[in-house]
């Protein structure tokens, strides 16, 4: 057992059916000594009496919030939660497995840049009783800081019958330089909350290999005389690290028809402007990547052709 | 990334071209390290995340773009002396602290190809016979050397008289190039920041 | 008593369906996960899927993925495999279980 | 997906002998493995999880050791009720694999 927040501890239990539990004793914080009652949640059964109180934790009906009295005055509460361990693994219900980019991915986390900021999302499909906290730093052994906000609901999504919930938090490298070589991964954990169960999820990653760019600004086409050609130009997104030139971008330029079955050209280039053919009903798409590190493609900055 | 590969202007700061194709060669021998070796812990999660340079060279910091000088995080006070007469260097332009950087990135080279080498003749006595450094790789890094044409000690290639535990030395050399890798991106970033000045 | 009791196979033809149920008494059902595996005739066991508590998050083997579909209802207490296309492959003993606990095992026969 | 392989695939042995099955992991899979053992035409029975933990009611003879790749299941003294086929599993990624099985023989 141990306290996640005043008055607010969690009981790690092997959890399997007929599994023995755990003994717990709970000790009223209160300098009486005698004629203390003991009780559950909004139940009025006394369950013992005396300055503590030793229950066999088992199951979620042995959890809950274990409040002291004496003469009808409560003196103090303890709130029980309960760790799953199954199979000597801690438990996974409350997040949704994203599978991407590998099975037991439940965090997922991108940066815009390497200012040192990112961003981090989670999905559930539990929409009520449900609390998260967000700690983060940077190594484990001796953590540098890292200051996270409080998460927050960002999307609602129905998926088949059920709904589907996205949280996410934003979080800040206290002292980020961003042309440092990482070599202690940033640490992200995640505790959350639903109703009596605790769960804790983690991860761990490099800045740069989250890394993935706001789509190119300012798509604009040229149409170049006596020809079926254009000019396409485009910028580095605002909130790209500078300075380009050192944080330089690779591009990808693509001519897509209006139906996806028709053949896509594309085009890679490191520089900010390239010539393509505009066909008519076509777009025309322009998406960005680190030129010198291969994380992820920015979303497409799209214009058409006509 | 299968890309199409431009050629180098004439003109061009004349270690751009030599660093691209150091960044394509540590990326490809990376890569087929992981494929290689995939019941060994190679990936990026698995390994410990060392700098065979820490304390010896100063390059982020020495290499550092003006515009981040004014950002205190990136203000490490490692203060190395160096030799100053790279032929990489637009001659009387070149300031001191460019100069301290080139020669920065050509101890990092040495260091490495002096590792890489020394793991290449260990990895030739696998009876397994499993992974090798790539020839390519190791040439990129010699011709990168030359293009930065410091003066500097040779230093001697370290032998072993043990008996090489191939298991670890195949774990190191994930460990090498993945800290390779990542300098690589240091200093093709280093060089394009130099041309585009 | 904790108790899993498996129904439903049977003989099926190869492109058939089948549906399995699993019904647990003798402890609190949805706060398990839960696993169905299978054995095919003389062979060794085999996983198929699983399920968390809660049904947030869902598994299954590659060789059953986009045919065979793992849900439970924690009003019922029971456990369900719903099983499409089957292959004469899918011949075994499918077993529900929540470790240390295992059904008696249901078995499926598919054959033209 | 990880591969377990079990050895040996039988052996024979006599009531009150030691036995050692082994179990290995193709990667790191740390000490996420299940021992089981199963009667003919019956249900498998759960052991041994964690690599090393009994579940409440397997008797003390049987003993589980092991992380990252190499595991072993020990019956410190082979009983007549203990002849069957006993299986490792990882439950450390998905897919869950199973190891083909070490069928015990009475001598």
């Known amino acids: 057992i141990w306290e996640l927040k005043k008055d607010v501890y969690v009981v790690e239990l092997d959890w399997y059916p007929d599994a023995p539990g755990e003994m717990v004793v709970l000790t009223c914080d209160t300098p009486e000594e005698d004629g203390i009652t003991w009780t559950l949640d909004q139940s009025s059964e006394v369950l013992g009496s005396g300055k503590t109180l030793t229950i066999q934790v088992k199951e979620f009906g042995d959890a809950g919030q274990y409040t002291c009295h004496k003469g009808g005055e409560v003196l103090s509460h303890s709130l029980l939660l309960l760790h799953k361990k199954e199979d000597g693994i801690w438990s996974t219900d409350i997040l949704k497995d994203q599978k991407e980019p590998k099975n037991k991915t439940f965090l997922r986390c991108e940066a815009k840049n390497y200012s040192g900021r990112f961003t981090c999302w989670w999905l559930t499909t539990i929409s009520t009783d449900l609390t998260f906290s967000v700690k983060s730093s940077r190594g484990s052994s001796d953590p540098q800081g890292v200051t996270c906000g409080a998460a927050t609901l960002s999307a609602e999504r129905v998926r088949g019958d059920n709904k589907e919930y996205e949280y996410s938090v934003e979080c800040q490298e206290d002292s980020a330089c961003p042309a440092a070589e990482e070599s202690l991964p940033i640490e992200v954990m995640v505790d959350a909350v639903h109703k009596l169960k605790y769960e804790n999820y983690t991860s761990s990653f490099f800045i740069r290999d989250i890394i993935k760019p706001d789509p190119p600004k300012n798509l604009q086409l040229k149409p170049l005389k006596n020809s079926r050609q254009v000019e396409v130009s485009w910028e580095y997104p605002d909130t790209w690290s500078t300075p380009h030139s050192y944080f330089s971008l690779t591009f990808c330029v693509q001519v897509q028809g209006k139906s996806k079955r028709e053949k896509k050209d594309r085009v890679f280039t490191d520089k900010t402007s390239a010539t393509v053919i505009c066909r008519k009903n076509a777009s025309i798409s322009v998406r960005a990547q680190d030129r010198y590190y291969s994380s992820s493609w920015s979303e497409w900055a799209s214009v058409p052709c006509s | 990334r299968n890309l199409p590969v431009a050629t180098p202007d004439p003109g061009m700061f004349p270690c751009l071209h030599h660093s691209q194709n150091l960044l394509r060669a540590v990326s490809n021998m990376l890569q087929k390290a992981r494929q290689t070796l995939e019941f060994y812990p190679c990936t990026s999660e698995e390994i410990d995340h060392e700098d065979i340079t820490k304390d010896k060279t100063s390059t982020v910091e020495a290499c550092l773009p003006l515009e981040l000088t004014k950002n205190e995080s990136c203000l490490n006070s490692r203060e190395t002396s160096f030799i100053t007469n790279g032929s990489c260097l637009a001659s009387r332009k070149t300031s001191f602290m460019m100069a301290l950087c080139l020669s920065s990135i050509y101890e990092d080279l040495k260091m490495y190809q002096v590792e890489f080498k020394t793991m290449n003749a260990k990895l030739l006595m696998d009876p397994k016979r499993q992974i090798f450094l790539d020839q390519n790789m190791l040439a990129v890094i010699d011709e990168l050397m030359q293009a930065l044409n410091f003066n500097s000690e040779t230093v001697p290639q370290k032998s072993s008289l043990e008996e090489p535990d191939f298991y670890k030395t195949k774990i190191k050399l994930c460990i090498l190039l993945h800290a390779f890798r990542i300098r690589a991106v240091t200093i093709d970033r280093v060089m394009s920041y130099l041309n585009a000045s | 008593e904790v108790k899993l009791v498996e129904s439903g196979g049977g003989l099926v033809q190869p492109g058939g369906s089948l549906r399995l149920s699993c019904a647990a008494s003798?402890?609190?059902?949805?706060?398990?996960?839960m696993v169905w595996v299978r054995q095919a005739p003389g062979k060794g066991l085999e996983w198929v899927a699983s399920?968390?508590?809660?049904?947030?998050?869902?598994y299954y083997a590659d060789t059953v993925k986009g045919r065979f579909t793992i849900s439970r209802d924690d009003s019922k207490n029971t456990l369900y495999l719903q099983m499409n296309s089957l292959k004469t492959e899918d011949t075994a003993v499918y077993y529900c279980?929540?470790?240390?606990?295992w059904g008696q095992g249901t078995t499926v026969t598919v054959s033209s | 997906d990880i591969v377990m392989t079990q050895s040996p695939s039988s052996l024979s042995a006599s009531v009150g002998d030691r036995v050692t099955i082994t179990c290995k992991a193709s990667?790191?899979?740390?000490?996420?493995v299940a021992w089981y053992q199963q009667k003919p035409e019956k249900a498998p029975k759960s052991l041994i999880y964690?690599?090393?933990h009994r579940y409440s009611g397997v008797p003390s003879r049987f003993s589980g050791s092991g992380s990252g790749t190499d595991f072993t299941l020990t019956i410190s003294s082979l009983q007549p009720e203990d002849f069957a086929t006993y299986y490792c599993?990882?439950?450390?990624?998905?897919?869950?694999?199973f190891g083909g099985g070490t069928k015990v023989e009475i001598k």
């Open positions: 990667q790191n899979v740390g000490t996420n």
């Open positions: 599993q990882q439950y450390n990624s998905y897919p869950l694999t």
């Open positions: 964690s690599a090393s």
């Open positions: 399920i968390s508590s809660g049904s947030s998050n869902i």
């Open positions: 279980a929540r470790n240390p606990y």
């Open positions: 003798g402890f609190t059902f949805s706060d398990y996960g």
